[in-house]
Interface confidence: low
């Protein structure tokens, strides 16, 4: 057969379903990988083809589109399920092709079980809800173009296990759910299950999100430098280990960078020749308001590396701050000589 | 400009009916959860209904089934049916645009509002 | 429903004056919590939402506290536009939008 452009299997879109449910899925090529859509491709005489990889085979098999009730159906650039089976997990392929021109991408699929709390190998998106911010919603996802807007779905909501009704702080309303004064009881998975007719007969999407319940932007504060501090002084002899802890506390922004470094005499540690090493952990509250520890560590220090500046610089989105640390060389105790007068003169 | 336009007040006999709009302009409705407040001549404000994002809608208690509130997002457009009308109605009605989806359910832009007359 | 009591019903004072005007919920409603402010033949004006949170655009002079039960409206240095009806209102849980019967501010 002809050359074709083949974009390989695009594990970066590993699409999970679940069981008897109905699925859709949009051919990639046309959303990440031509810079044209479906119908430019469809005007311009191009043919969209289907074909996958059963689980644990390599044989390319066609797509079986003349299942009773069309189970398998395509629709313009839209594969659809209508419902999954266990055993339609594989790698699905679509190619657009003329006589002169081929392009086509792999991706996997699979369809996965989930038990009757709605628990399953399913990885699962996280929304973050600010805590005590006032009303916020979050709404049930990928559920856009399975009925049209002349349907009227029903939308059931769980936390857990549980239908959410007459919760103190949850309420549903239709497609969203409000979260009146989120609060860390809040956190946990939110499922919308999603009930519509097709063709005499009735559908579920299922959906859950995870909710992590994080700090408010209204008490955010710029980063807070615990230590080095002014009550600490780290007095050493040549030939010690200096060993100073930069420790920050970074309220929960979203989308912020938290950054912690050093530099010695205003430079960044590695523009040095000095043998220091900094090792980073960090820690988080539960509502993800982070702290950030950087111990820089001079295994034996010189007098020369006692008289140099520390400073701990940390920024995030909300400003940036630096604290020197108090260093200095440990003044060696003084000898004294003690004599004893043994033989007192007798008079 | 983000405005709001009530329109619909008149003289209305007890037992009539009235449907109250509010315009709005410079925002998609669609977006923004929406109230009615009333206020009776020379006295203080009386939430009447809010129309949310979702299509939940809620009432205060002593309408009691007589006022719907409705929204036509294509339209750009907020309703309130009033049926059943009395004299205790009579009052200016305006609307509200609450603060934001993620805000505290405050009336952040009001309209000028309308004036319902009940009277025989 | 949420019942809002507001005090005093009005109150007279000078500009210059520190004005307060107490909101009580007869239960929690945590800091959901606005104020309005309205002079006569206009629609009322967002001042202070979220019990403290001052709504952009007013003056610094107003504020707000108080959480649970217990609200309060405080006009640091009364100026002459300031003389007004303010109304507090309950924002809790969707199907609540109770007023409180408003406070005239008249001048002294």
């Known amino acids: 057969s002809e050359r074709c452009d083949d974009w390989g299997l695009d594990t970066m879109r590993q699409i999970q379903v679940f069981e008897d449910e109905p699925a859709r899925i949009k051919c990639p090529l046309f959303e990440h990988f031509l810079k044209f859509n479906y119908s430019t491709a469809h005007s311009a005489g191009l043919t969209l083809i289907w074909y996958w990889t059963r689980q644990d085979r390599d044989l390319e098999e066609p797509i079986n589109f003349r299942l009773p009730e069309n189970r398998i159906s395509k629709e313009k650039d839209v594969l659809w399920f209508r419902p999954t089976l266990l055993n339609d997990t594989g790698n699905y392929t679509c190619m657009l092709r003329n006589t002169t021109y081929c392009s086509k991408v792999a991706f996997p699929l699979e369809v996965v079980q989930k038990d009757s709390c709605f628990n399953s190998p399913m990885k699962l998106p996280v929304h973050k809800l600010y805590i005590e911010y006032g009303i916020q919603r979050i709404t049930c996802p990928n559920v856009d173009g399975y009925f049209p807007s002349s349907v009227k779905p029903t939308i059931t909501w769980y936390m857990g296990c549980y239908k959410i009704q007459n919760f103190n702080n949850v309420i549903p309303e239709g497609m969203n759910l409000s979260f009146l004064i989120a609060l860390i009881s809040n956190n946990g998975n939110y499922t919308c299950v999603v009930t519509y007719p097709e063709n005499g007969r009735t559908f579920h999407l299922t959906r859950t999100l995870t909710v992590k319940v994080v700090g408010s932007p209204k008490n955010a504060v710029p980063p807070v430098i615990h230590s080095p501090n002014d009550h600490v002084v780290y007095e050493k002899e040549p030939g010690e280990e200096l060993l100073i802890p930069c420790t920050v506390y970074f309220s929960f922004l979203m989308d912020s960078r938290n950054e912690v470094w050093w530099t010695i005499d205003g430079k960044k540690p590695d523009d040095i020749t000095i043998d220091v090493t900094i090792n980073e952990s960090i820690s988080h509250s539960r509502t993800e308001d982070e702290t950030r520890t950087q111990i820089l560590s001079i295994k034996k220090v010189t007098s020369e590396d006692l008289k140099r500046s520390y400073v701990c610089h940390a920024r995030s989105a909300k400003g940036e701050v630096a604290k020197a640390a108090k260093v200095k060389q440990k003044v060696p105790a003084p000898r004294y000589t003690v004599e004893l007068a043994c033989g007192f003169g007798a008079t | 400009e983000v405005q709001l336009e009530e329109s619909g007040g008149r003289l209305v006999q007890p037992g009539g009916s009235l449907r109250l709009s509010c315009a709005v302009s410079?925002?998609?409705?669609?977006?923004?959860?929406m109230s009615w407040v009333r206020q009776a001549p020379g006295k203080g404000l009386e939430w009447v209904s809010t129309i949310y994002i979702g299509g939940t809608t809620a009432y205060a208690s002593w309408p009691k089934g007589r006022f719907t509130i409705s929204r036509d997002n294509s339209k750009n457009t907020l309703y309130l049916q009033m049926n059943s009308l009395r004299a205790e109605d009579t009052a200016v009605y305006f609307c509200a645009r609450l603060q934001g989806a993620n805000y505290y359910n405050s009336l952040a832009l009001w309209g000028q509002g309308t004036l319902v007359t009940v009277s025989s | 429903d949420i019942q809002m009591t507001q005090s005093p019903s009005s109150l007279s004072a000078s500009v210059g004056d520190r004005v307060t005007i107490t909101c009580q919920a007869s239960?929690?409603?945590?800091?959901?919590l606005s104020w309005y402010q309205q002079k006569p033949g206009q629609a009322p004006k967002l001042l202070i939402y979220a019990a403290s949170d001052l709504e952009s655009g007013v003056p610094s002079r107003f504020s707000g506290s108080g959480s649970g039960t217990d609200f309060t409206l405080t006009i640091s240095s009364l100026q002459p536009e300031d003389f007004a009806t303010y109304y507090c209102q309950c924002n809790y849980i969707i199907d609540y939008g109770a007023f409180g019967q408003g406070t005239k501010v008249v001048i002294k």
């Open positions: 410079g925002f998609s409705l669609s977006s923004y959860d």
């Open positions: 239960q929690s409603i945590y800091s959901f």
